[in-house]
Interface confidence: medium
Amino acid sequence: EPHSLRYNLTVLSWDGSVQSGFLAEVHLDGQPFLRYDRQKCRAKPQGQWAEDVLGNKTWDRETRDLTGNGKDLRMTLAHIKDQKEGLHSLQEIRVCEIHEDNSTRSSQHFYYDGELFLSQNLETEEWTVPQSSRAQTLAMNVRNFLKEDAMKTKTHYHAMHADCLQELRRYLESSVVLRRTVPPMVNVTRSEASEGNITVTCRASSFYPRNIILTWRQDGVSLSHDTQQWGDVLPDGNGTYQTWVATRICRGEEQRFTCYMEHSGNHSTHPVPS
């Protein structure tokens, strides 16, 4: 899994007038990391783990960056010509990643009223626009504005890519939290299914980093993919992750099945409770 930093900003307009505030959230390695507190005009860490990433900092740098990004997005929304009466939103999602081989990826996506209309690879500066005519119109509108704005030049996109990666590296380098290993807690439960069958569920929780193998085995052999159901690997809000895998088995054959877990070089097997 690559390390990633994901910015999610939203600005609103009402009856064609762009509102002064903005919404912003930042995810680090898929975990809610920062949000912009509109009432306090500050970037705020999301939970203790986020505070631990940078230690006792004032988050001024993050506040400044998010505020600048919010203002840019408000200006962009002001240049969308086809705004009708009522409430409208412009959302920008920007993601940068550092992979294990040290290669990087950066992209930017714009949504109007929740509909994707423009994407950009920030490394190649290649734009992608969905086929719908509404998306084409919106994209032309926004791209023309971005071209007109002296700040939104080739240099600017390179800087956006570089700044995101620089922040990500800063978090990774300064944080013991992001270099730690937290082994999962594994819990196996059973529940009644159809007559003669039971559903067994294996849950792994509170682990870090995100990479994990969790699978059911019968007589020591992994079951096929299509006989198991997997949950997504999701953040649990504490800087760690959780996931699950389930399968249906015949009652009476429980002892033949085990849940196999592999995480950060360690592995374990967990039987079905009787």
């Epitope: 009432q39 001024d60 400044r64």
Partner: antibody, heavy 118, light 107 residues
């Protein structure tokens, strides 16, 4: 009608502790987004923000004075307090409390004057 | 800390003049800039919020402009009651800082 009023000792000796009270009406510090801060102004000089407390008891301090400052509140009595330890003659000023909601100070008290003198 | 620099320190004007007061931030603060007026022996009063947004009850002759690090407070037609000191405030980065003020005098 929103009003804020500061009260304090008026005169202190160097090294003593200053205790200020801001009593307000017309709004509540239990309302989400509400905050009250302290700002001071030496005679004939500019404004300096000192400390701020929010509805959720989040507190902000000016880093240059943080070790001396403690801000607190009594929501039920509509009061905010500021303590400054080890005052010096440089702390002689008018102290204002002000309401801050959406990023700016929209209502101010009349101020209370402190003189630090030996 | 963000340093707010106001100029000029003092401004002497004639009633009816249009005047501009300048405020510069040591780094970009977007539009998180607020203006206050303080008359002699009074507490400060909010004039303009977020660089250019007007405040209810403030005469329309007061207006604000600017973004980033350069800001201006304009008074369309100065009246004698406008005498006082005008402060700008950084509402963006902690700690919140004020400019040194511009004193407006009537000739």
């Amino acid at each position: 009608q929103i009003t804020l009023k500061e009260s304090g000792p008026g005169i202190l000796k160097p090294s003593q502790t200053l205790s200020l009270t801001c009593s307000f009406s017309g709004f509540s510090l239990s309302t989400s987004g509400m905050g009250v801060g302290w700002i001071r102004q030496p005679s004939g000089k500019g404004l300096e923000w000192l400390a701020h407390i929010w509805w959720d008891d989040d507190k902000y301090y000016n880093p240059s004075l943080k070790s001396q400052l403690t801000i607190s509140k009594d929501t039920s009595r509509n009061q905010v307090f500021l303590r400054i330890t080890s005052v010096d003659t440089a702390d002689t000023a008018t102290y204002y409390c002000a309401r801050r909601t959406q990023g700016y100070f929209d209502y101010w008290g009349q101020g209370t004057t402190l003189t630090v003198s030996s | 800390d963000i340093v707010m620099t106001q100029s000029p320190a003092t401004l002497s004007v004639t009633p009816g003049d249009r005047v501009s007061l300048s405020c510069r931030a040591s780094q970009s603060i977007s539009d998180y800039l607020h203006w206050y007026q303080q008359k002699s022996h009074e507490s400060p009063r909010l004039l303009i919020k977020y660089a250019s947004q007007s405040i209810s009850g403030i005469p329309s002759r007061f207006s604000g402009s600017g973004s980033g690090s350069d800001f201006t407070l304009s008074i369309n037609s100065v009246e004698p009651e406008d005498v006082g000191v005008y402060y700008c405030q950084n509402g963006h980065s902690f700690p919140w800082t004020f400019g040194g003020g511009t004193k407006l005098e009537i000739k």
